[in-house]
Amino acid sequence: TGADTEAVVCVGTACYTAHSGKLSAAEAQNHCNQNGGNLATVKSKEEAQHVQRVLAQLLRREAALTARMSKFWIGLQREKGKCLDPSLPLKGFSWVGGGEDTPYSNWHKELRNSCISKRCVSLLLDLSQPLLPSRLPKWSEGPCGSPGSPGSNIEGFVCKFSFKGMCRPLALGGPGQVTYTTPFQTTSSSLEAVPFASAANVACGEGDKDETQSHYFLCKEKAPDVFDWGSSGPLCVSPKYGCNFNNGGCHQDCFEGGDGSFLCGCRPGFRLLDDLVTCASRNPCSSSPCRGGATCVLGPHGKNYTCRCPQGYQLDSSQLDCVDVDECQDSPCAQECVNTPGGFRCECWVGYEPGGPGEGACQDVDECALGRSPCAQGCTNTDGSFHCSCEEGYVLAGEDGTQCQDVDECVGPGGPLCDSLCFNTQGSFHCGCLPGWVLAPNGVSCTMGPVSLGPPSGPPDEEDKGEKEGSTVPRAATASPTRGPEGTPKATPTTSRPSLSSDAPITSAPLKMLAPSGSPGVWREPSIHHATAASGPQEPAGGDSSVATQNNDGTDGQK
């Protein structure tokens, strides 16, 4: 298949090559793959600009492109059966070389959903418009083509080759020609960065005359992550030109001797490297040795450096990297300490709030304080908790055990409280009698009285009503007649209760409030006392107390 490398751009640790040729996406990928690469990724705006540059290079040399709107394959594809995902930047497409779903995209138009065939992406170039960095090629999605039928307007493709590192271009100090041969079989005489394992052939001389010298170099790793040719001194130097040709091939300063010879030098603050051409900063911080947020600080006379960490961090054993200080190891808080990146915060247990003497101190929350009591009636504060109680004639009720509910004495267990009629009232009850009967002095029994056609005696008086003020479960007074053994109606008991005596008050068991360990109880959001962080203090997401269900074992709340 005819695909010619027309252009190459190397930058960072990758090279991009642009090829013209009407190939299917699979053929294009195969071509890239044969030389150790893949169809190009366009994972960022910067990468899009690199790809645009290599396409611009190609278009400058390529006169015979047939379509005004030309398309060049890139390595973005969606397999058959995989459907469009409009929520993702890549819409369900993925890069052929693998890798994460990247945030950058530049779709030409809204994609139509189609899962039945493989889809491939090309860069859409309008050849009637100049290629500008501000106008990056759009992504066009379509069929992937097949051998001999690449698809509409497909004019070529872009490959990407990744490398361990790059060498700087060789500097010539006199007339000559450098030819670089890359590992992906491209030859070029002008690369702004030359990939690792490339060869450089240098032919010195004017070109028309006999060449006097030739050199061969390989771009290799001279030390960890240090890539260089290993040449020393400028190449193709000529006494005829001295420093006048390309600054003698020197990186910074060029110094001529009287005999036409010259040497490279460096400006103050820089030193000459082993290649006798390149200058590097004397400042040891210029190589950014510090990592993880550490700042490089020059030592005396600029000779060495130390790394310094922001507040709340410390240097690790390498002395180059910052790690979080665990301030909680020093127990700075009265109750709970939460280590955070660059700081910490104190939290109080449930039922406590920030306050009291000292940093990180906690004090008991008085849940029974005026205006904040969660109890319907009685409230007793305890250290870190509270419990609710109810007045006589009421019992604790509600899911959270903070409400009070009237006890219906007329249906209490242990037998009927009244001999005849029973009238339940808020917080109490009264007995009554059927017509012709009157209530005995004990308030429970009925005795035969004068015949009367009026209503049954003993309904509650007005003053009996509303005894249980504050109850959230009001009940209407009801009479519950039942038939006793002699045929007289009696109340039907339903709740267990000891036999009533005038001096036996009805009291509630205290509510057990528990910490948020999974048991029910009063749960209060932890409240934050303070924070020390580079980013400043953080507000808690605290809130009002919420109340859980009642525990029936009659113990006080604890956290």
Epitope: L218, K220, S231, L320
Partner: antibody, heavy 118, light 112 residues
Amino acid sequence: QVQLVQSGPEVKKPGESLKISCKASGYAFSSYWLNWVRQMPGKGLEWMGRIYPGDGDTDYNGKFKGQVTISADKSSGTAYLQLSSLKASDTAVYFCVRGDGYWAMDYWGQGTLVTVSS
Amino acid sequence: DIVMTQSPDSLAVSLGERATINCRFSKSLLHSNGITYLYWYQQKPGQPPKLLIYQMSNLASGVPDRFSGSGSGTDFTLTISSLQAEDVAVYYCAQNLELPWTFGGGTKLEIK
């Protein structure tokens, strides 16, 4: 398998020169750094220099610069260490060592004992 | 040049016991790429050195797992968890971060 085979022991007089060879096999000779390491009797190891046979690029330890020359012949897969103006203090075992992709010295020659004595 | 100090000069340990050799460098060997360019070599009498540990903590091919390497940017340790008779040798640390490559002075390990 990777092998580095060095030339045999040498006895030299002070002021003479000497060229030790190291024949490599079992790997792509041109694509790995080849180091030379000295070990004086009863002493530790000292790195002298290295060569990249692919293009002949060399690096030397400043301590040995001017006294030693490292070269290589790609076609035969052989590296050389030349010692000039020998002194009694050059008496040592000289090792050739391959540098691997992890910057380790992974394969060592058996060593060449050089004795300089009048 | 990066200077290294190896300690102790010699060490006697009983068979089956743990042996520890230390090496300190004048400069951090932790590269900005996250790799620490520290190596350990073993040299038995009359033999060339043999690579034991590369890049601080990685065991070279064929090396028993009783050998381990650890450390930080400047301080490193070679540990033999249970000394065997065949471990009697001189051990060297080395750095390959910056030219010239340098070796520690060596630690002679013997059986007590």
